[in-house]
Interface confidence: low
């Protein structure tokens, strides 16, 4: 009888009640798998899931969420509400990102901005809910006599050139030379 | 309980904006979403969208290009404005809250009776 | 967009009646099929989601069916307070779309 079972291909079952060995699965059920002595019952996709694929007799049905709500888990076990940019989702429900977080994301936790400092870089953008600080050069890149050697490009907002990059550098520039002669004039007052 | 309060005008001149504000109480519009439907004699039940919890927005894509519905989770208000109305957008507008366990509406305001008239 | 046709505008019953009001779907919508009630002067309430899950607090004499394209709500002993309009709702996608009711009188 085992090796008569091993015949039954996908979508039927090894009935040993019948004399027709294998019996096609009954209706809202499937097996996906050959010489199985059960149909398993097709998942049903209510409330918050709706059917992304249809169960057929060889395979299970395919949940998704309905709109407003997102998928968690293997195989879309869960359905979790959707929250907008800048917010995350707690037991009360959507909340904004405190100050220092962000989630650029309908899903999912407020993470902390980047820390530009360690990486020995400065903020060029500053960071909001919904969107990550910009780190740009590092202050020594900045400097006069600086290396010439290019440092990679940030990741940038749109609308942030580079041409901004280089006012900051020249600024940066003509303020260390406006304080250079501020202390030389300091001095020379104090000789006199 | 739970209760959906409108409040907005009657009569609206074609061409011109409807605006109607949706007071909820009882339920909290960071936990449930907000639909807005409209019923009138020749069209029957129209669903025009619906704001989530989250603030996210759908729309009914016959009505995207002229609708809003924006909300003020701190004053428990959802604000439905439709621009360039005309005489066929006569209807009852409806707001309605959307439960946790479907797109469906299980409670619903009073309704607001629009007249596009000159 | 989906159409839901209630073919039915209205339907006679008596007090203790079983009564059957058909919703079909212009295509596929699975289980995702809502059924309300509107009372005269009342404001419209879910009975029915997901074609046959109660929504609480639902009298267990209502009861949703179907799947894909035909979909039934049943009452079963009708009520005298049950006398009302039905509309079938579909939230497989948008739009979301109605039925055009189905109106409960008495014989």
């Known amino acids: 009888l085992q090796d008569l079972c091993s015949n039954c291909p996908a979508g039927t079952f090894c009935d040993n009640n019948r004399s027709q060995i294998c019996s096609p699965c009954p209706p809202n059920s499937f097996s996906s798998a050959g010489g199985q002595r059960t149909c398993d019952i097709c998942r049903q996709c209510k409330g918050v899931f709706k059917t992304r694929k249809e169960c057929s007799s060889t395979s299970n049905a395919e949940c998704d969420c309905i709109s407003g709500y997102h998928c968690l888990g293997a195989e879309c076990s869960m359905c979790e509400q959707d929250c907008k940019q800048g917010q995350e989702l707690t037991k009360k429900g959507c909340k904004d990102c405190c100050f220092g977080t962000f989630n650029d994301q309908k899903r999912g936790i407020c993470r902390p901005w980047t820390n530009c400092s360690l990486d020995g870089k400065s903020v060029l953008v500053n960071g909001t809910k919904e969107r990550d600080v910009v780190c740009g050069p590092s202050p020594a890149d900045l400097s006069p006599g600086a290396s010439s050697a290019t440092p990679p490009a940030p990741a940038r907002e749109p609308g942030h050139s580079p041409q901004i990059i280089f006012f900051l550098a020249l600024t940066s520039t003509v303020v260390l030379f406006l304080l250079f002669f501020l202390v030389l004039d300091y001095k020379d007052d104090d000789d006199k | 309980q739970v209760q959906l309060k409108q409040s907005g005008p009657g009569l609206v001149q074609p061409s011109q904006s409807l605006s109607i504000t949706c007071t909820v109480s009882?339920?909290?519009?960071?936990?449930?979403?907000v639909h807005w439907v409209r019923q009138s004699p020749g069209k029957g039940l129209e669903w025009l969208g619906v704001?989530?919890?989250?603030?996210?927005?759908d729309y009914n894509a016959a009505f995207i290009s002229r609708l809003s519905i924006s909300k003020d989770n701190s004053k428990s208000q959802v604000f439905f404005k439709m621009n360039s109305l005309q005489a066929d957008d006569t209807a009852i507008y409806y707001c309605?809250?959307?439960?946790?366990?479907?797109?469906?509406?299980?409670?619903w305001g009073q309704g607001t009776s629009v007249t596009v008239s000159s | 967009d989906i159409v839901m046709t209630q073919s039915q505008k209205f339907m006679s019953t008596s007090v203790g009646d079983r009564v059957s009001v058909t919703c079909k779907a212009s295509?596929?919508?699975?289980?995702?099929v809502a059924w309300y009630q509107q009372k005269p002067g009342q404001s419209r309430t879910v009975l029915i989601y997901s074609a046959s899950y109660r929504h609480s607090g639902v009298p267990d004499r209502f009861t949703g069916s179907g799947s894909g394209t035909d979909f039934t709500l049943t009452i079963s002993n009708v009520q005298s307070e049950d006398l009302a309009e039905y509309f079938c709702?579909?939230?497989?996608?948008?739009?979301?779309?109605f039925g055009t009711g189905t109106k409960l009188e008495l014989k």
């Open positions: 009882g339920f909290s519009l960071t936990s449930y979403g």
């Open positions: 704001i989530w919890s989250g603030g996210s927005t």
């Open positions: 309605a809250r959307n439960p946790l366990t479907a797109t469906v509406m299980d409670y």
């Open positions: 709702q579909q939230y497989n996608s948008y739009p979301l779309t």
């Open positions: 295509q596929n919508v699975g289980t995702n």
